[in-house]
């Protein structure tokens, strides 16, 4: 009778993570008597995957009933495949012996490759806010994919970015891989509503790439512009001085009025108006009684925005001449109870 051969018909098998792998193996004879075992890898360090007669292998099932007298099908199924299961699997026939069973014949091996989806890309921006015209870095990370080939693109508001560097680790063979990319983005004053998108394409995603996003509203700081104006209101001896704070982001802002260098009032921006580009406007005003003044008054609007050093704009109030209209009130609303008399 012809000597037993162990046949593994599949040189390779490709399985998606989470699915079941079927590894086929048949023997050409019932003789010699002895069990079939499956191993991953070869040599002394090989890992036992299945033993026909003993051992605990909860993920493994046999395709056919190995207790049938004439069974020569030793194919197995391995459930819930992960990238860690990748490798070459050998179906090995043993001959019963003493003290231990003796390896008799091995199949040629079946290489199991595992396709694993990348994790959802996570995009993170700089720890501190930056102002327009500055360049900031964004990172994108995705993990756990296999095979190694992967494509990563960066977009800002739908426009593809070109200034980025990408690494896939590890460089050598591995059960799964990670990608890390850093993109440089130049901020503009219009970026409050902008988004940076990291897009990852992989064979497991069937043409439907994964995206991670970062809102530039978390990154940008648009400093305000200040304008101080005056116009007469009510009685002729009263002047309304307004401080227009325009185009700032984020909203966190504190305004202080100074009269001849002395603090008059401090307030926090509350009822702001939002511009189409996502920045904010706000106006504060002060009523000044000039009738008792012999000298000019220097009024300063000082703004501290988002914890940054204060910026200020001053206005000289002439008290010698009859107050004339200087500038116009361009704000739709006045805020707070801001009357202030100077005696």
């Amino acid at each position: 009778e012809e000597e037993l051969q162990v046949i593994q018909p599949d040189k390779s098998v490709l399985v998606a993570a989470g699915e079941t792998a079927t590894l086929r193996c048949t023997a050409t004879s019932l003789i010699p008597v002895g069990p079939i075992q499956w191993f991953r890898g070869a040599g002394p360090g090989r890992e036992l995957i299945y033993n026909q007669k003993e051992g605990h292998f909860p993920r493994v099932t046999t395709v056919s009933d190995l207790t049938k007298r004439n069974n020569m099908d030793f194919s197995i199924r391995i459930g819930n495949i992960t990238p860690a299961d990748a490798g070459t699997y050998y179906c090995v026939k043993f001959r019963k012996g003493s003290p231990d069973d003796v390896e008799f014949k091995s199949g040629a091996g079946t290489e199991l490759s595992v396709r694993a989806k990348p994790s959802a890309p996570v995009v993170s921006g700089p720890a501190a806010r930056a102002t327009p015209q500055h360049t900031v870095s964004f990172t994108c990370e995705s993990h756990g994919f296999s095979p190694r080939d992967i494509t990563l693109k960066w977009f800002k508001n739908g426009n593809e970015l070109s200034d980025f560097q990408t690494n896939v680790d590890p460089v050598g063979e591995s059960v799964s891989y990670s990608i890390h990319s850093t993109a440089k983005v130049v901020l503009t004053r219009e970026d409050v509503h902008s988004q940076v998108i990291c897009e990852v394409a992989h064979v497991t995603l069937q043409g439907d790439p994964l995206r991670g996003t970062a809102n530039l509203s978390e990154t940008i700081r648009v400093p305000p512009t200040l304008e101080v104006t005056q116009q007469p209101v009510r009685a002729e001896n009263q002047v309304n001085v307004t401080c227009q704070v325009r185009k700032f982001y984020p909203q966190r802002l504190q305004l202080t009025w100074l009269e001849n260098g002395n603090v008059s009032r401090t307030e926090t921006a509350s009822t702001v108006t939002e511009n189409k580009d996502g920045t904010y406007n706000w106006m504060s005003w002060l009523l000044v009684n000039v009738s008792a003044h012999r000298d000019d008054v220097k009024l300063t609007c000082q703004v501290e925005h988002d914890g940054q050093p204060a910026v200020s704009k001053s206005h000289d109030l002439k008290v010698s001449a009859h107050p004339k209209e200087q500038g116009s009130n361009t704000a739709a609303e006045n805020t707070g109870s801001n009357e202030r008399n100077i005696y």
């Epitope: 008597v33 890992e47 036992l48 007669k53 003993e54 009933d65 190995l66 207790t67 003290p99 231990d100």
Partner: antibody, heavy 114, light 108 residues
Framework: EVQLQQSGVEVVQPGASVKLSCTAS????????MHWVKQRTEQGLEWIGR????????KYAPKFQGKATMTADTSSSTAYLQLSSLTSDDTAVYYC???????WGQGTTLTVSS | QIVLTQSPAIMSASPGEKVTLTCSAS???????LYWYQQKPGSSPKLWIY???NLASGVPPRFSGSGSGTSYSLTISSMQAEDAASYFC?????????FGGGTKLEIK
């Protein structure tokens, strides 16, 4: 449901023999080796040997060679452990264990006493 | 035959304490063939860890196993009262198969 049902308490005289049984249900006994393990009171576990019920082939730990004999009857899905020339050293609990190692019988307590 | 030596033979641990039990083999054992059992008084042993590091069904994740060659260990990250039991390592790498002498783990 997989179960291994072992015979009850045995009290035997020194020098005699005893045959312990282990009846399997919920699986085909021929699909796995069947192991036997000894545990003396408050002691460790000792591997006695294993049998392949499919063909009766068996392996023994050197210590139990000549002392223990394992057999199996596939028609009744039962494995047996025969212990001969009993002494007080054989007083112990004897377990049968399916080859996949996660299913154990409840144990048979053997007392050798005159 | 391969002799498995477990240490310590007996130990006690406080709740929340990290516990490590060791199993040393007299000659190399392939990690696929090194198992651990838990046994409580009056009960049959229960398969606890198989193939060195895989937890059997129902075993809490505070348990872990590791090792290779001649040195293996079972670790409990945070000891609980229900972990008080005897633990045995077992090799079926070569005949005769052997158990370690066991470690009796008590709760303080």
């Amino acid at each position: 449901e997989v179960q291994l049902q072992q015979s009850g308490v045995e009290v035997v005289q020194p020098g005699a023999s005893v045959k312990l049984s282990c009846t399997a249900s919920g699986f085909n006994i021929e699909a796995y080796y069947m192991h036997w393990v000894k545990q003396r009171t408050e002691q460790g576990l000792e591997w006695i040997g294993r049998i392949d019920p499919e063909d009766g082939e068996s392996k023994y730990a050197p210590k139990f060679q000549g002392k223990a004999t394992m057999t199996a009857d596939t028609s009744s899905s039962t494995a047996y452990l025969q212990l001969s020339s009993l002494t007080s050293d054989d007083t112990a609990v004897y377990y049968c264990v399916r080859g996949s190692y996660e299913y154990w019988g409840q144990g048979t307590t053997l007392t050798v006493s005159s | 035959q391969i002799v498995l030596t477990q240490s310590p033979a007996i130990m006690s641990a406080s709740p929340g304490e990290k516990v490590t039990l060791t199993c040393s083999a007299s000659s190399s054992v392939s990690s696929s063939y090194l198992y651990w059992y838990q046994q409580k008084p009056g009960s049959s042993p229960k398969l606890w860890i198989y193939s060195t590091s895989n937890l059997a069904s129902g075993v809490p994740p505070r348990f872990s196993g590791s090792g290779s060659g001649t040195s293996y260990s079972l670790t409990i990250s945070s000891m609980q009262a229900e972990d008080a039991a005897s633990y045995f390592c077992y090799q079926w790498s070569s005949y005769p198969y052997t158990f370690g002498g066991g470690t009796k783990l008590e709760i303080k």
